[in-house]
């Protein structure tokens, strides 16, 4: 997977008046890395590994960049004409990537009230606008303002592209991101399924990087794909990832099944617990919104199985 740096800024308006603050998060390689602390007006690292990336250097540069970006985005929101009464948001997501072959990609996306209305490839400067008439109107509004603003010239977009990549390279130079491995915690649980069957679930959590093999084996042989159900590999909010795999087996055959895990060159096998085990089973539903705002994980029900 490519290395990536992702800036996510949001500004708000109320009854047509742009609010003074802004929300900002920065993700490094898909992990929460920086957050703008509105109380202290400073960029703050998210967790120990983020602090380790810069070592003893200060976060002044990041604070300055985020503050400047927030100010630009507030000005952009002020120029959006169709602001009706009530609360509205303008969100900018900027991403740059360095791929294994050293090629780079950079893009910028604008969302109004959670709806994508304008994208730009920062390398080719090519703009993309969704088909809807609302998006077309918003995009015209914003593009006109950006053209008027002397700061938003051709060189500005090249600079945004270059700055993002420069920061990404600076973070990667520390070696913390490249070297970082956190082994998963693996947990196997069982729950009642239909008569004579049980569902066995293998969960891997708190691991980094995100690449992992998690599969059920029967007698040491991997079960076919269609007999297993996999969860997505998702961030768990601590700078690490989580995932799961489940399958249905016949009661009494538990000893034949093991969960096999492989991560960052290490592997392990985990048997199915025998007997009656008390299992807290959470059913998580993943709502995927394409507006770039936070994904929602909704705990639908929690059941005790005995």
């Amino acid at each position: 997977e490519p290395h990536s740096l992702r800036y996510n800024l949001t500004v708000l308006s109320w009854d047509g008046s742009v609010q003074s603050g802004f929300l900002a998060e920065v993700h490094l390689d898909g992990q929460p890395f920086l957050r703008y602390d509105r109380q202290k007006c400073r960029a703050k690292p998210q967790g120990q590994w983020a602090e380790d990336v810069l070592g003893n250097k200060t976060w002044d540069r990041e604070t300055r960049d985020l503050t400047g970006n927030g100010k630009d985005l507030r000005m952009t929101l002020a120029h959006i004409k169709d602001q009706k009464e009530g609360l509205h948001s303008l969100q900018e997501i900027r991403v740059c990537e360095i791929h294994e072959d050293n090629s780079t990609r950079s893009s910028q996306h604008f969302y109004y009230d959670g709806e994508l209305f304008l994208s730009q490839n920062l390398e080719t400067e090519e703009w993309t606008v969704p088909q809807s008439s609302r998006a077309q109107t918003l995009a015209m509004n914003v593009r006109n303002f950006l053209k008027e603003d002397a700061m938003k010239t051709k060189t500005h977009y090249h600079a945004m592209h270059a700055d993002c990549l420069q920061e990404l390279r600076r973070y990667l130079e520390s070696g913390v991101v490249l070297r970082r491995t956190v082994p998963p915690m693996v947990n196997v649980t069982r729950s009642e399924a239909s008569e004579g069957n049980i569902t066995v679930t293998c969960r891997a959590s708190s691991f980094y990087p995100r690449n992992i093999i998690l599969t059920w084996r029967q007698d040491g042989v991997s079960l076919s794909h269609d007999t297993q159900q996999w969860g997505d590999v998702l961030p768990d909010g601590n700078g690490t990832y989580q995932t799961w795999v489940a399958t249905r087996i016949c009661r009494g055959e538990e000893q034949r099944f093991t969960c096999y895990m492989e991560h960052s060159g290490n592997h392990s096998t985990h048997p199915v617990p025998s007997g009656k085990v008390l299992v807290l089973q959470s059913h998580w539903q993943h709502h995927h919104h394409h507006h770039g705002l936070n994904d929602i994980f909704e705990a639908q029900k929690i059941e005790w199985h005995e």
Partner: antibody
Framework: QVQLKQSGPELVKPGASVKVSCKAS????????IYWVKQSHGKSLEWIGY????????VQNQKFKGKATLTVDKSSSTAYMHLNSLTSEDSAVYYC???????????WGQGTLVTVSS | DIVLTQSPTTMAASPGEKITITCSAS???????LHWYQQKPGFSPKLLIY???NLASGVPARFSGSGSGTSYSLTIGTMEAEDVATYYC?????????FGSGTKLEIK
């Protein structure tokens, strides 16, 4: 490449016991199960049991419970099968085998001939 | 235990001839759990076909497998001298794993 090298032939007296070894190389030993199979002279194959080298967990053919004990030594990447209270019925070639994760007995050792005779 | 019955027990074929060996299970098994092995005289068994129809690494394309439920077969498209061996089917569906009694293939 994956190789399973078994210990040499054994001639043992009835009532005695024997330990057959199977040294694995060419792959991460704890990644895949080791299976044991018996082949009596001129006969078919019989599965004895298997062991997961990572955690030592075993699954055995009921017929060989009490007869065969499966163990591993992770430090030397070696699996062992201990056969006790030997009788002439136990005279056979014993094979160890391992998997590639997709089929049961993908790779086989060369076999160990155990002869029980007074 | 699942009993696997192979037929024929022995057979002789001429080079170039098409060979079919059958394996009948005493109870139904999923095709994912049926494998075939070849054992040449004085050697260890060798995996030939796994999961009913998948050729193991290095196995010539003249070998093929098919079947479902209780009835499975191994086919050699054109018999060659080096195919002289005993062939075993094996099930991994239920414990204990069992092997067929073997089919000894000779050359005419």
């Amino acid at each position: 490449q994956v190789q399973l090298k078994q210990s040499g032939p054994e001639l043992v007296k009835p009532g005695a016991s024997v330990k057959v070894s199977c040294k694995a190389s060419g792959y991460a030993f704890t990644k895949y199960n080791i299976y044991w199979v018996k082949q009596s002279h001129g006969k078919s194959l019989e599965w004895i049991g298997y062991i997961d080298p990572y955690n030592g967990g075993t699954v055995q053919n009921q017929k060989f419970k009490g007869k065969a004990t499966l163990t591993v030594d992770k430090s030397s990447s070696t699996a062992y099968m201990h056969l006790n209270s030997l009788t002439s019925e136990d005279s056979a070639v014993y094979y160890c085998a391992t998997t590639d994760g997709y089929s049961l007995f993908t790779y086989w050792g060369q076999g160990t001939l155990v002869t029980v005779s007074s | 235990d699942i009993v696997l019955t192979q037929s024929p027990t022995t057979m002789a074929a001429s080079p170039g001839e098409k060979i079919t060996i059958t394996c009948s299970a005493s109870s139904s098994i999923s095709s994912n759990y049926l494998h075939w092995y070849q054992q040449k005289p004085g050697f260890s068994p060798k995996l030939l076909i796994y999961r009913t129809s998948n050729l193991a690494s290095g196995v010539p394309a003249r070998f093929s497998g098919s079947g479902s439920g209780t009835s499975y077969s191994l086919t050699i498209g054109t018999m060659e001298a080096e195919d002289v061996a005993t062939y075993y089917c094996q099930q991994g569906s239920s414990i204990p794993f069992t092997f067929g009694s073997g089919t000894k293939l000779e050359i005419k």
